[in-house]
């Protein structure tokens, strides 16, 4: 296994609809044709997997049907979007990239993006 640098933004604020997007960029040492991207959430020293996708270069990034993540790839960049976030989902979201093919296998782990999620205040009843 060889180490690889992965860059991602330090902080992202989710929209009022609970959607957060960020770019995960990896420094590929060669021309990878099969890449696996995983988003991990770290909170209270616990690490959980949010979503993952394996894709072939030039093809769409496909997450499972029930995944809260969507994404697109362009070169060595992956544009990730996480949906359905609530205030309780605030935490550090880490991008992990694995170059599966061709050999050698590379693993890169970003420093994480702190995603802040603020639940919208319910609209007060208005009299007309």
């Amino acid at each position: 296994c060889k180490a690889m640098h992965v860059a991602q933004p330090a902080v992202v604020l989710a929209s009022s609809r609970g959607i957060a997007s960020f770019v995960c960029e990896y420094a590929s040492p060669g021309k990878a044709t099969e890449v696996r991207v995983t988003v991990l959430r770290q909170a209270d020293s616990q690490v959980t997997e949010v979503c993952a996708a394996t894709y072939m270069m030039g093809n769409e990034l496909t997450f499972l049907d029930d995944s809260i993540c969507t994404g697109t790839s362009s070169g060595n960049q992956v544009n990730l979007t996480i949906q359905g976030l609530r205030a309780m989902d605030t935490g550090l979201y880490i991008c992990k990239v694995e170059l599966m093919y061709p050999p050698p296998y590379y693993l890169g782990i970003g420093n994480g993006t702190q995603i802040y999620v603020i639940d919208p205040e319910p609209c007060p009843d208005s009299d007309f």
Partner: nanobody
Framework: EMQLVESGGGLVQPGGSLRLSCAAS????????MGWYRQAPGKQRELVAD???????NYADSVKGRFTISRDGAKNTVGLQMNSLRPEDTAVYSC?????????????WGQGTQVTVSS
Amino acid sequence: EMQLVESGGGLVQPGGSLRLSCAASGNIFSRYIMGWYRQAPGKQRELVADITPGGNTNYADSVKGRFTISRDGAKNTVGLQMNSLRPEDTAVYSCYARGSDKLLMRTYWGQGTQVTVSS
């Protein structure tokens, strides 16, 4: 924790065929590179073949055209079909899995199965 169990080794004559199988326990089979290494007595361990989750394969030059690796996601198994076997293919063949578990890189190994090519 993933466990790998190999089967299918044995004694075969030169020019013969053998099929090795590796069964993986655990639910991380689909995200790991799976493959085979071999080690002959007094020699260094060498990669034979491996296969990615996407089905891309990689072979040692010495086995290209003779060996075929495959994976069955439904059964969590990796197979190695070995044809036109030669005496120099005699070795202990070990299944391996390489990938990552959360923030850690992992490599798992099977216990190995003996393949002997002799007349």
